[in-house]
């Protein structure tokens, strides 16, 4: 719900966007993920912090966890144990990478409303989780896994060679986290508990980068991070699996890898538990175009886990690399065998495919000239998927559902028609056996989140509606947008225009373009949002676009795998060829004309200002990529191959942002970056600086001293202060 | 510690109301349903019904026309009243309490109370 | 009303015995299945609840299984304290019902 536009008699009581309002987070949302626990029950944090679970079908709600108790050991976070006699209460949390951290925890009996004494857990934890059933726990500790058969149990230790960056079990690496997981866990209960999965990652042999982190002491210490840049030793991987009844039995039992997988360097890319005795790998090799489904079963006789090759699926681009960002995984049926798993069709669309014996024989379930994107859930008789289907756009998302049980199978789109303007960006989350469900929806206009009958899709009531940012943005000007697109050459590109308040088509604006533009991403969404360039077309009249061009997502294989093996040409080309195209629209004045992006975008940014064009005055570049020789090796090998002669060298070497600084001279160019990054490294900005110094070229820099790759805290609000000043003096715009 | 006790008159006579309280400490109102069942003589178990943390109630359709269970929380009380009794009502009165924790499962009874319907 | 039919209604088992209960219920219950266990003028105690579950402080030896309609309630060695009789419930649904009962003796 976007507030109405008001008649110019009403505009001296409304107010442009402040810088301030941004930075204070003034106009942030709310979304309501219901934390699940059964088919008809969730828990949630009540406003005063007690722990509430609400049975959607009695509409009764039960304090099981009060503030107090939370706040008796300054707890953040909680998790109920699944036979729901325990309670862990997570506090001390210390942020590692993106996703990982540490803790501290406690036991909490709700039987007894009394913490569990003796045999505490030791302290800091690395990763901790119930079982699926009933309240065993394990946990990493010092990069070795442990269990307990109860809370107040002696732990049992399972693995013993963890060692820090060098032997992980049970969590990630650096690379294993950020590139490949996207979790701080590696670690997989069986459906019943019976056996618990996991991961060791062997980093022994990869080089490590090493960074200063200065602190507040006399000498700086150094991080130093197992990070295989493109080319280098990989970590070596290794999947393990113990009966955790009898532990002690016959101990962890590795899972053997596909030969076809095994003959190379290769990736582990997820685990799926099938049932309590069948388990589904993934495995990828590391030129990533060829991915291996292996299905396992555990032998009683032997006590070890056979994955037979008539169970193998393998999953082969031509024309790219495998999967999109990453390559999906399957969603089993109740025959606990046959799987529905989203890949590419032959006309180069990702969608939906029901695998019953071989790849081969895949039955296609959704197809046409979109892409489905996530499966939610299979039931005996529906799946619930989100595509971006409706109406064309692809910067949209809806949930569908397809009814399996009858056939020919039939289609409802349970979200296109609910709340058609305001809601256009859909996601959700689902109890048990899809008995409830709820969707939260992300815009385009104020986002709210419903709670919905699983069988009749009926909504049943509204969970967060973010009345009081409604209540908030009545007297804001905020910009107007528009979500259009670009024919050119055979190609589409989808854009987003943010337009000042009073925007009149036959007055000139500056133009910034916000860009990110990676690989398999997409910037052009159908999603609510005020935040800094919406605060430049508000209050400073600035135009802002964000296009989506070759490489990016959602679109068909044509256009995501157009980029590959060649990083940095058409990504920066789309870029010019738009703002070309908005020129001609004859309300840009093309003498004011910007881009800035961060990191992948960061690096576009470079690249489009270093293009030679004479289109940009300015940019502005925040902890970009400089060199794919400097950048992890599961991503950048992904779309780029490896950096070797015999490979790809040659456009590692022509895609660097250094062989372009001549051409910076003239433009106005800002280059940002923490020095704490431990994900596109300071090096990455070192380089560009020392390149364009070599050159002699004149450029504008600023570091943030012990900040990593989000720039958080206090840094964010120098950062966009600075940005602002830097673009109001590019575009001469008064302060 | 947790703890519920039945109290209220042994004998009723038949065509009264049967009225029975249950009064209850060692545990938040807020977390907890409460159940009343009851068995009579050498019989088996049979439900009530109960009033949900939130004052709602829900009764077994046998006796619903028969039946009202209410609370007053700042007494830690609950109360069952059965109308138009006959001596098939005569019975072991419990009062129970469920909740979530236990997926609405019966976690601790009172001690009882026989209830006679008779002349 | 889902009907909860238990069988036997009585057994007789010696010291040391592994004990079976069976309970079937009318239509799915998933696994919202509970097990009570009452001694002569003694209000019944919760044993097992979700079908599976031990209550806090209840014995290993005893254990309950099963989903959807079939349902197991086992003492892995029988004791003398164990002498009661044993009740399934249903907590998926109101009204709540119990089955019939089934009284456990020593040989």
């Known amino acids: 719900l976007r507030p109405s536009r008001v008649h110019n008699s009403e505009e001296n009581t409304m107010r442009a966007l402040t810088l301030k309002d941004i930075l204070n987070g003034t106009f942030s949302y709310k979304t309501f993920f219901p934390n699940w626990i059964s088919g008809q029950e969730y828990l949630h944090q009540s406003a005063d912090n007690n722990i509430v679970l609400y049975n959607i079908e009695t509409g009764q709600s039960y304090t099981i966890l009060s503030n107090r108790t939370m706040k008796s050991v300054n707890a953040s976070n909680y998790g109920l144990s699944p036979d729901r006699q325990f309670v862990y209460l997570e506090s001390d949390y210390s942020k590692l990478w993106r996703y990982s951290y540490t803790a501290t925890y406690y036991i909490y009996d709700l039987s007894n409303g009394e913490f569990v004494r003796g045999n505490e857990l030791p302290r800091p934890i690395q990763y901790l989780c119930w079982s699926p059933v009933g309240s065993k726990l394990a946990y990493v500790y010092q990069n070795n896994i442990y269990l307990k058969q109860r809370p107040g149990d002696p732990p049992f230790q399972i693995t013993f060679n963890g060692r820090e960056n060098k032997i992980f079990n049970g969590i990630p690496d650096w690379v294993y986290e950020e590139e490949m997981l996207a979790t701080k866990y590696a670690l997989w209960w069986s459906p019943n508990g019976k056996f618990l999965a996991y991961a060791e990652f062997n980093d022994t042999d990869i080089p490590v980068i090493a960074y200063s982190y200065y602190g507040d002491e006399q000498y700086p210490r150094t991080i130093n991070i197992p990070y295989p840049k493109a080319g280098a030793k990989n970590p070596v991987v290794r999947i393990f699996i113990i009966d955790t009844t009898y532990p002690a039995y016959v101990g962890p039992q590795e899972v053997p890898v596909p030969a076809m997988i095994a003959s190379s360097d290769y990736y582990f890319s997820w685990l799926t538990w099938v049932t309590d005795e069948r388990v589904c790998l993934q495995w990828l090799k590391r030129v990533q175009n060829v991915s291996v489904l292996s299905i396992c079963d555990f032998r009683e006789d032997w006590q070890t886990w056979d994955c037979p090759k008539t169970q193998e699926h393998i999953e082969e681009s031509r024309t790219g690399w495998a999967g999109g960002f990453f390559v999906s995984t399957p969603v089993f049926s109740y025959d606990a065998i046959s799987y529905y798993k989203i890949f590419s069709d032959k006309d180069g669309y990702k969608h939906i495919h029901y695998i019953k014996d071989t790849v081969e024989n895949a039955i296609q379930i959704t197809s046409g000239k979109w892409e489905a994107i996530n499966i939610f859930r299979v039931t005996q008789d529906s799946l619930f998927y989100s595509s971006n289907e409706f109406e064309e756009y692809p910067g949209r998302r809806n949930i569908y559902r397809i009814s399996i049980g009858s056939y020919p199978p039939s289609k409802k789109c349970v979200t296109c028609h609910l709340r058609k303007e305001r809601c256009q960006y859909y996601t959700a989350s689902f109890s048990d056996y899809a008995k409830y469900y709820a969707l939260v929806c992300y815009g385009p206009g104020i986002p709210i989140s419903t709670l919905h009958d699983g069988r009749t899709d009926q909504e049943i009531k509204i969970l967060e509606e973010n009345k009081e940012l409604e209540n908030a943005l009545k007297n804001i000007q905020l910009p107007k947008e528009e979500i259009k697109k670009l024919e050119v050459d055979e190609i589409t590109l989808w854009y987003k225009m943010i337009l000042p308040p009073q925007f009149d088509r036959s007055k000139k604006y500056p133009l910034l373009i916000q860009v990110y533009g990676g690989p398999c991403s997409q910037s052009v969404r159908s999603v609510f949002a005020v935040n800094w360039i919406s605060y430049l077309a508000s209050k400073e009249g600035m135009v802002i676009a964000l296009v989506d061009g070759r490489g990016t997502a959602f679109q068909g294989d044509k256009l995501l795998y157009a980029v590959y093996r060649k990083l940095g040409v058409y990504e920066v080309e789309d870029q010019i060829t738009a703002v070309r195209k908005f020129i001609e629209m004859g309300f840009i004045d093309e003498k004011r004309i910007a881009i800035w992006g961060w990191s992948y975008g960061g690096y576009v940014s470079s690249l489009a200002l270093a293009s030679g064009t004479g289109l940009f005055k300015c940019g502005i570049a925040v902890a970009p990529v400089s060199s794919w020789e400097y950048y992890a090796s599961v991503y950048t090998e992904r779309f780029m191959g490896l950096p070797t002669k015999d490979d790809n060298l040659e456009h590692y070497k022509n895609s660097t942002v250094m062989a372009r600084a001549e051409y910076f001279r003239n433009v106005d160019y800002l280059l940002i970056h923490g020095t704490a990054d431990d994900n596109v490294h300071f090096q990455n900005s070192a380089q560009i600086a020392k390149a364009l110094v070599n050159a002699q070229v004149d450029f504008q820099a600023m570091w943030y001293s012990d900040q990593n790759h989000g720039l958080s805290g206090l840094s964010t609000n120098h950062l966009y202060t600075h940005m602002t000043h830097f673009l109001k003096q590019c575009f001469s715009l008064s302060d | 510690q947790v703890q519920l006790q039945e109290s209220g008159p042994g004998l009723v006579k038949p065509s009264e109301t049967l009225s029975l309280t249950c009064t209850v400490s060692?545990?938040?109102?807020?977390?907890?349903?409460i159940n009343w069942i009851r068995q009579p003589p050498g019989k088996g178990l049979e439900w009530i019904g109960l009033?949900?943390?939130?004052?709602?109630?829900n009764y077994n359709p046998s006796l619903k026309s028969r039946v009202t269970i209410s609370k007053d929380t700042s007494k830690n009380q609950f109360s069952l009243k059965l109308s138009s009794v006959t001596a098939a009502d005569t019975a072991v009165y419990y009062c129970?309490?469920?909740?979530?924790?236990?997926?609405?499962?019966?976690?601790?009874w009172g001690q009882g109370t026989l209830v006679t319907v008779s002349s | 009303d889902i009907q909860m039919t238990q069988s036997p209604s009585s057994l007789s088992a010696s010291v040391g015995d592994r004990v079976t209960i069976t309970c079937k219920a009318s239509?799915?219950?998933?696994?919202?299945v509970a097990w009570y266990q009452q001694k002569p003028g003694k209000a019944p105690k919760l044993l097992i609840y979700?079908?599976?579950y031990r209550y806090t402080g209840v014995p290993s030896r005893f254990s309950g299984s099963g989903s959807g309609t079939d349902f197991t309630f086992t003492i892995s060695s029988l004791q003398p304290e164990d002498i009661a009789t044993y009740y399934c419930?249903?907590?998926?649904?109101?009204?709540?019902?119990f089955g019939g009962g089934t009284k456990v003796e020593i040989k």
């Open positions: 009033i949900w943390t939130g004052g709602g109630t």
């Open positions: 060692g545990f938040s109102l807020t977390n907890y349903d």
């Open positions: 129970v309490r469920g909740g979530p924790l236990v997926w609405y499962a019966l976690d601790y």
């Open positions: 239509q799915d219950v998933s696994t919202a």
């Open positions: 419930q249903q907590h998926y649904s109101n009204p709540r019902t």
């Open positions: 979700s079908a599976s």
